[in-house]
């Protein structure tokens, strides 16, 4: 899997999209996990609804939300109030039994807020030693979600 880079501004929301083949992954719940080290496990952050037919309902864990358009084949993760510590390597996963298929590897980069004049020294960027030569950058500027807003997929 290539790694897709999503860049967001500190303090704002970042929306990550993971497209997939809806028929291949029919009936499967999805998850968003954080890679712990290059070879380490991927720690679950949030997963879609327990009932696959309700995957369109936005599920939250802290400041991270997940919603799945199972008909269109797009998993969407929202990181609200992006912080420097949110930067790192993640995966979108498709779950089946105790197994998980990787849909997309995602590198989240947190950019300094241009309106914030504090020291940006604690912001994380991939260093030269890290190999993301296969990565392609996808700038994602997302609006803040309205409170209680729920996206529902079409049923026809």
């Amino acid at each position: 899997h290539n790694t897709t880079v999503f860049q967001g501004v500190a303090g704002q929301s970042l929306q990550v999209s993971c497209p997939y083949d809806s028929m291949k992954h029919w009936g499967r719940r999805k998850a968003w996990c954080r890679q712990l080290g290059e070879k380490g496990p991927c720690q679950r952050v949030v997963s879609t609804h327990n009932l696959w037919l309700l995957s369109f309902l936005r599920r939250w864990n802290g400041s991270t939300a997940i919603t799945d358009d199972t008909l269109g084949g797009t998993l969407t993760i929202t990181l609200r109030n992006l912080q420097p510590h949110d930067a790192g390597l993640y995966q979108c996963q498709s779950l089946h039994g105790s197994e998980a298929d990787t849909l997309r590897k995602v590198l989240v980069e947190v950019l300094a807020d241009p309106l914030d004049h504090r020291d940006a020294g604690d912001l994380w960027f991939p260093g030269e030693s890290e190999s993301f030569e296969d990565a392609h950058v996808e700038h994602s500027i997302s609006r803040s979600l309205l409170e209680g807003e729920i996206p529902f997929p079409p049923t026809s």
Epitope: L51, L53, L57, G148, I150, F152, P154, T155, S156
Partner: antibody, heavy 126, light 106 residues
């Protein structure tokens, strides 16, 4: 008039099978998710399971206590949803209701159920 | 699994009274909560969805509020036809109902 009518209830022995029907009228049946609920005598409501709209190709979900025993299906040509109940237990005794998942104005569905049938009684006893 | 605790289990009030029923979830369910009314011998009827949205055709004396774990259902002025059992139902985890609140007239 939008309407759901259940049928097929009755007295059945433990371990036997029964099939309930829910006949819909007054709306485009294929556009809606359909659900089954039950209510044991003098008790509260319990979700049994549901089936997605036509777009979801008959995909179903069930509560844990009936998984593997009950099967929900739908016949779009007849506008009927079915609940096939196998290996019935005495604790399955209840009034069974079918209900329609709410549909948003802009064509999306919602797990709130806005139309219900009158219910059909299922008694499991030897 | 989520537990939905409704209180009180029953109440008696006079016509015109303000009636309040609470529903507490054992964990955060955002606003994924519906309220139903069930009259004796009848099927349930949807009153409120998404914790606070009034279903079409339902009288405005019924209302719902809350988010997270604590939710409230209110009848602003109790009417004789409101005699029923009221249920909350979450859809954050599965589709779990509260135990119901039976409302009677004094």
């Amino acid at each position: 008039e939008v309407q759901l009518v259940e049928s097929g209830g009755g007295l059945v022995q433990p371990g036997r099978s029964l099939r309930l029907s829910c006949t819909a009228s007054g709306f485009t049946f294929g556009d809606y998710a359909m659900s089954w609920f039950r209510q044991a005598p003098g008790k509260g409501l319990e979700w049994v399971g549901f089936i997605g709209s036509k777009a979801y190709g008959g995909t179903t979900e069930y509560t844990a206590s009936v998984k593997g025993r009950f099967t929900i299906s739908r016949d779009g040509s007849k506008s009927i949803a079915y609940l096939q109940m196998n290996s019935l237990k005495t604790e399955d005794t209840a009034v069974y209701y079918c209900a329609r998942g709410k549909r948003r104005d802009y064509g999306y569905w919602h797990p709130a159920f806005d139309v219900w049938g009158q219910g059909t009684m299922v008694t499991v006893s030897s | 699994d989520i537990q939905m605790t409704q209180s009180p289990s029953s109440l008696s009030a006079s016509v015109g009274d303000r009636v309040t029923i609470t529903c507490q979830a054992s964990q955060d369910i955002t606003n994924y909560l519906n309220w139903y009314q069930q009259k004796p011998g009848k099927a349930p009827k949807l009153l409120i969805y998404d914790a606070s949205n009034l279903e079409t055709g339902v009288p405005s004396r019924f209302s719902g509020s809350g988010s997270g774990t604590d939710f409230t259902f209110t009848i602003s002025s109790l009417q004789p036809e409101d005699i029923a059992t009221y249920y909350c139902q979450e859809y954050d985890q599965y589709l779990t109902f509260g135990g119901g609140t039976k409302v009677e007239i004094k």
